[in-house]
Interface confidence: medium
């Protein structure tokens, strides 16, 4: 097209630009080591560093690892992207009682409205179920299902949400993403099929490298790239996303190209010593007598650091389950965490990783 010549000519003799025939305009040539954020970059700000899979480019332009959603009570809400961390949220049927960056530190099951109460607002990943008194004359069965949710199959109504019992399987032997999903519920949603895109957004045919957006014609490789599980931090450095591989942690938000993965204590535990994007020390969420039950709503969505309470005190408790079973927080493995050294000495896996990760992805034996 003759009318395109003047535009093409403006690129000639200018080494910092090239002509893109597809869009019929001059484009800025990203310097070596940077990749374009759009098809035809116009200025240096349209070029960026490229990170590896599972890493994102953070505000300081460093590749930093995305968070993991490896805890049983978390699911991935948004994947690890080139400029943002993976984000995790509480799995369906649960809500976040203690938030964390890009994740949730503590998930509880939604409350079931007790007899004489109906659902005012159904629970979400962020909020617990809100109940209200049933109007006089409304039968317990309720005319409208969305206005009244009765406990199914004769379950006892709960006065407050209950945390998930931490898995008692040999999660400590799992590599990075350990533990079994609760009842393998929603397996199709929580377990990636071999050919489906993984959380790092890469095709299964190329598992180790991030999908590189092709550079415009003649522009060369021009996007900063970090290794997998790293994100680009504020200083422009590739930084590892935190890993939630400890048995008492779960992933709240995923690793993105520019933000870290975040971890939180698994259900039934509370963070006694916080750490950047994670918790350095999780302690069992104590049981309390019926008269001392506190409202979890009081702490919903709070980003709080809890100091371990003095022995014998019960700051914020789980009601004893109605069926008389002791909650998992009384298990020996968890009580081991309540230790003066717990913030320094973390649980140590004692065997080699198992052959399959919790997502069914085979783990190669390098031996």
């Amino acid at each position: 097209f003759p009318q395109d010549r003047p535009f093409e000519d403006t690129c000639h003799g200018n080494p910092s630009h090239y002509y893109d025939k597809a869009v019929r305009r001059c484009c800025y040539r990203c310097p070596m080591g940077l990749f374009p954020t759009q098809q035809c970059p116009q200025r240096p700000t349209d070029c960026r560093k490229q990170c590896e899979p599972d890493y994102y480019l953070d505000e300081a332009d460093r590749c930093t690892a995305c968070v993991t959603c490896s805890r049983d009570d978390l699911v991935e809400k948004t994947p690890c992207a080139w400029n943002s961390s993976r984000v995790c949220e509480c799995r369906p049927g649960m809500f976040c009682s203690t938030s964390a960056v890009n994740s949730c530190a503590r998930c509880f099951f939604h409350s079931v409205c007790p007899a004489g109460m109906i659902v005012k607002f159904p629970g979400t990943a962020q909020k617990n179920t809100v109940c209200e008194p049933a109007s006089p004359g409304v039968s317990p069965a309720c005319a409208s299902p969305e206005n009244c949710k009765e406990p199914s199959s004769g379950t006892i109504p709960q006065a407050k949400p209950t945390p998930v019992s931490p898995a008692t399987s040999s999660a400590s032997t799992m590599p990075v993403r350990g533990g079994t999903r609760l009842a393998q519920e929603a397996a199709s949603k929580l377990t990636r099929a071999p050919d489906s895109p993984s959380s790092v957004g890469r095709p299964s045919s190329d598992p180790g490298l991030s999908p590189t957006q092709p550079c415009p014609e003649g522009s060369g490789d021009c996007r900063k790239q970090c290794e997998p599980d790293y994100y680009l931090d504020e200083a422009g450095r590739c930084t590892a996303c935190v890993s939630c591989s400890r048995d008492d942690l779960v992933e709240k938000t995923p690793c993105a190209w520019n933000s870290s993965r975040t971890c939180e204590c698994r259900p039934g535990m509370i963070c006694a010593t916080s750490a950047t994007n994670s918790c350095a020390r999780c302690v069992p969420y104590p049981i309390c007598a019926a008269e001392t039950v506190t409202k979890p709503q009081d702490m919903a969505e709070k980003d709080t650091t809890f100091e371990a309470p003095p022995l014998g005190t019960q700051p914020d408790c789980n009601p004893t389950p109605e069926n008389g079973e002791a909650p998992a927080s009384t298990s020996p493995t968890q009580s081991l965490l309540v230790d003066s050294q717990a913030s320094k000495t973390l649980p140590i896996p004692t065997s080699a990783p198992v052959a399959l990760s919790s997502t069914g992805k085979p783990v190669l034996d390098a031996g």
Epitope: R62, R237, P353, S357
Partner: antibody, heavy 123, light 107 residues
Framework: QVQLVQSGAEDVRPGASVKLSCKAS????????IHWVRQRPGQGLEWIGY????????DYNQKFKGKTTLTADKSSNTAYMQLNSLTSEDSAVYYC????????????????WGQGTTVTVSS | DIVMTQSPKSMSTSVGDRVTITCKAS??????VAWYQQKPGQSPKVLIY???YRYSGVPDRFTGSGSGTDFTLTISNVQPEDLATYYC?????????FGGGTKLEIK
């Protein structure tokens, strides 16, 4: 099994250049980045940078920018590191390495290493 | 860059002893730390990743722990074949950095 086989020892003069190779086998070459690590005599390990064989993208430790150039040849499953303007300070063992493929997260710790190439710079 | 300070630089121990090597990061690196063993004339071999996970085939006498800035490699019941130099590595933020190494000698 995964193997990284590096080229033989090099004796070079100051000011010269040298190109080291790292041939990968036992896996799909374009699937993993190849990293290079330097170890001077009696010293510790220093990360130089990596090359993405699939895209040709490379990233360097600022300390080694200008000194090293990383490339890869997909047809021969080989990664290369060229060292320029050599001085006695560049005398070292150079390793190529590859991260592991454990679990679902791909952090950069190295499960596979080449045997190393010794570069001696002397007049 | 993140500096990994390893101590001690060298240590002498006897077969059957328990030794502890520490590594301190100049800033928080979460649990993104690996430990390597390098025997004389050989390439490094990974022992521990994610601060506390033993790599496949590594004897269980090697134990890693720590998070944030303080990390430890413990070798219980030291064996003659453990004569080597041990390195920690942070892979939290690029550039990747290693500790200066700890040379373990067997009496």
């Amino acid at each position: 099994q995964v193997q990284l086989v590096q080229s033989g020892a090099e004796d070079v003069r100051p000011g010269a250049s040298v190109k080291l190779s790292c041939k990968a086998s036992g896996y799909t070459f374009t699937t993993y980045t190849i990293h290079w690590v330097r170890q001077r005599p009696g010293q510790g390990l220093e990360w130089i940078g990596y090359i993405n064989p699939s895209s040709g993208y490379s990233d360097y430790n600022q300390k080694f920018k200008g000194k090293t150039t990383l490339t890869a040849d997909k047809s021969s499953n080989t990664a290369y590191m060229q060292l320029n303007s050599l001085t006695s300070e560049d005398s070292a063992v150079y390793y190529c390495a590859r991260r592991a493929d454990y679990g679902n997260y791909e952090y950069t710790w190295f499960a596979y290493w080449g045997q190393g190439t010794t570069v001696t710079v002397s007049s | 860059d993140i500096v990994m300070t390893q101590s001690p630089k060298s240590m002498s121990t006897s077969v059957g002893d328990r030794v502890t090597i520490t590594c301190k990061a100049s800033q928080n690196v979460g649990t993104n730390v690996a430990w390597y063993q390098q025997k004389p004339g050989q390439s490094p071999k990974v022992l521990i990743y994610s601060a506390s996970y033993r790599y496949s085939g590594v004897p269980d006498r090697f134990t890693g722990s720590g998070s944030g800035t303080d990390f430890t490699l413990t070798i219980s019941n030291v064996q003659p074949e453990d004569l080597a130099t041990y390195y920690c590595q942070q892979y939290h933020t690029y550039p990747l950095t290693f500790g200066g190494g700890t040379k373990l000698e067997i009496k």
